[in-house]
């Protein structure tokens, strides 16, 4: 069962005694306001569930709520992938999937969500307060990340509700594309609101699920108003992040299309049909400069063919053969 976090609906003030024309002029600002707040505001949700049957087994599900085309998904644990986290799986819509122990099976669930089953014991076993992060790279929105973990009091078999992603940063591709239009709309909106100064402007209230959580930093100017609508959850620092990570043994994963939901309306015509597949995102209120993996010169040293230490915050990297888990 999944309960989605609700975003409170914005209610415009009553038009009062204004005439039809006045009412009509007020409709446009609210339409624009809704656009300013919602358009170009992709979200990443993260759901972590501990299996009732196996206490050391976790299922992480991540989804991308945006209209863009997904280019890559990265799932990490122990924190954001670029900030101390260790990569568990990387998924590309055409080139495939690669995963590392204790990840057992990473797969696309839909065109915009993925799931990852983790299991293990000992050093590589996840524990209840582990933080899992998902990063989605998409066009035109850019890179979006969010993290989630099981609440300390979670009963096995229950899942943490999906966590909406905080607004961290959209890459220039998303900013330039959507924000120009939005900026114009928002400026016009402010202009219209100014003309109705006698009417108090409505206050945008963030979701009240975690009122004391620090607010996500808005990296893009166009997101200033968006950030006010989302309060990130507090990320729990994990004390059981593994020091070592075994290289995942190659195994045959499910066929590419097998991960389509049974209710899918149509079978995609080819890998490109996965254009909106999601990409896991980074930490909630951790301010992450999005270097798009481009920091050069650092790679995890290898201690042997089967055992790898990952002091590098970006963790292990891996590749998949086309359309499958290698």
């Amino acid at each position: 069962m999944r309960t989605e976090a609700q975003v409170p609906a914005l209610q415009p003030p009553e038009p009062g005694l204004e005439g039809a024309m006045g009412h009509r002029t007020l409709v446009l600002p609210w339409v624009l306001l809704t656009l300013c707040v919602t358009a170009g505001t992709p979200e990443v949700w993260v759901q972590v569930r501990m299996e009732a049957t196996e206490l050391s087994s976790f299922t992480i599900r991540c989804g991308f709520l945006g209209s863009g085309s997904i280019s890559l998904v990265t799932v990490s644990w122990g924190g954001p992938n670029g900030a101390g986290g260790t990569t568990l799986a990387v998924l590309h819509p055409e080139r495939g999937i690669r995963q590392w122990a204790p990840a057992r099976q990473a797969r696309w669930e839909t065109q915009s969500s993925i799931s990852l089953i983790l299991e293990g014991s000992g050093a590589s076993s996840p524990c209840a307060n582990t933080t899992f992060c998902c990063k989605f790279a998409s066009f035109p929105e850019g890179s979006w990340e969010a993290c989630g973990s099981l609440p300390p009091s979670s009963d096995p078999g229950l899942s943490a509700p999906p966590t909406p992603a905080p607004i961290l940063r959209a890459d220039l591709a998303g900013i330039l594309g959507v924000s120009g239009v939005l900026l114009f709309g928002c400026v016009y909106l402010l202009h219209l609101l100014r003309r109705h100064k006698h009417r108090p402007a409505p206050r945008l209230q963030p979701s009240r699920t975690s009122p004391q959580a620090p607010r996500a930093r808005a990296w893009a100017p166009s997101q200033a108003s968006q950030a006010a609508l989302h309060v990130p959850y507090a990320t729990i620092n994990t004390s059981c992040r593994p020091a070592t990570l075994d290289t995942a043994h190659p195994h045959g994963g499910p066929s590419w299309w097998a991960s389509l939901p049974t209710h899918a309306a149509h079978r995609p015509q080819g890998p490109a049909a996965w254009a909106s597949t999601p990409i896991p995102a980074r930490g909630s209120f951790v301010s992450v400069e999005n270097g798009l993996y481009a920091q050069a010169g650092e790679r995890p040293p290898h201690t042997g063919p089967g055992l790898t230490l990952f002091p590098d915050p970006r963790g292990p990297r891996a590749m998949e053969g086309p359309l499958g888990v290698r």
Epitope: S69, I70, S71, L72, V90, H92, P93, E94, R95, G96, R98, A137, S138, F139, P140, G142, S143, D171, L172, A173, G174, A272, A275, G291, L292, Y293, A294, A296, G297, E298, R299, P301, H302, T308, R314, P316, R317, A318, M319, E320, G321, R326
Partner: antibody, heavy 122, light 107 residues
């Protein structure tokens, strides 16, 4: 089929600039990066830099920093590589190749463009 | 930068021979290594990715192995159409670097 088609050969004078285009077809352009590699006559392959089509983010070889600019036009699925302040040792065949949207994962180059010969001569 | 040392720089073998090319990385690159074939006047073509995975459509006589710093590329039975220069390429770190190439000729 997946294809990269590059612009034609260029002859330039030292100090000039050249802009090579690379038009992609047969795949979702923004799912990948475009990587630029050059090959001087009789020499090996040299990575020049790359651009991630979904974001426009770039990485350039240190020796070319400040002289090279890589861009994309997602509406036409075309990548561009501009090299300025040309010198005689920039004479080479310039290739574009399809690679990953992150250099760290899934990053093999396939396919390659047919190459564009740029000759720098006074 | 990670240096890729490819050897030999050239070799001559008979049709049907087993040909082996090695590539050594100056630092650990796990299996982030690809092999390409380039024929004169043509663009390179991908043969092997991630050290050992055979690219779609590539004949099975080509194979790759290795991990960490030492990699091997093998043509199990050399064919006349295999006359080309072969390059290894790493992407374990930026900058992406290529080996110097191995020119394969027929005796």
């Amino acid at each position: 089929q997946v294809q990269l088609v590059q612009s034609g050969a260029e002859v330039k004078k030292p100090g000039a600039s050249v802009k090579v285009s690379c038009k992609a077809s047969g795949y979702t352009f923004t799912h990948y990066g475009i990587y630029w590699v050059r090959q001087a006559p009789g020499q090996g392959l040299e990575w020049m830099g790359h651009i991630y089509a979904y974001s426009g983010d770039t990485d350039y070889a240190q020796k070319l920093q400040g002289r090279v600019t890589m861009t994309t036009d997602t509406s036409t699925s075309t990548a561009y590589m501009e090299l300025r302040s040309l010198r005689s040792d920039d004479t080479a065949v310039y290739y574009c190749a399809r690679g990953s949207p992150t250099y760290e994962h899934f990053n093999w180059f396939d396919p390659w463009g047919q190459g564009t010969l740029v000759t720098v001569s006074s | 930068d990670i240096q890729m040392t490819q050897s030999p720089s050239s070799l001559s073998a008979s049709v049907g021979d087993r040909v082996t090319i090695t590539c050594q990385a100056s630092d650990d690159i796990s299996d982030y290594l690809n092999w390409y074939q380039q024929k004169p006047g043509k663009a390179p073509k991908l043969l092997i990715y991630d050290a050992s995975s055979l690219h779609t459509g590539v004949p099975s006589r080509f194979s790759g192995s290795g991990s960490g710093t030492d990699f091997t590329f093998t043509i199990s039975s050399l064919q006349p159409e295999d006359i080309a220069t072969y390059y290894c390429q790493q992407y374990g770190n930026l900058p992406i670097t290529f080996g110097g190439g191995t020119k394969v000729e027929i005796k």
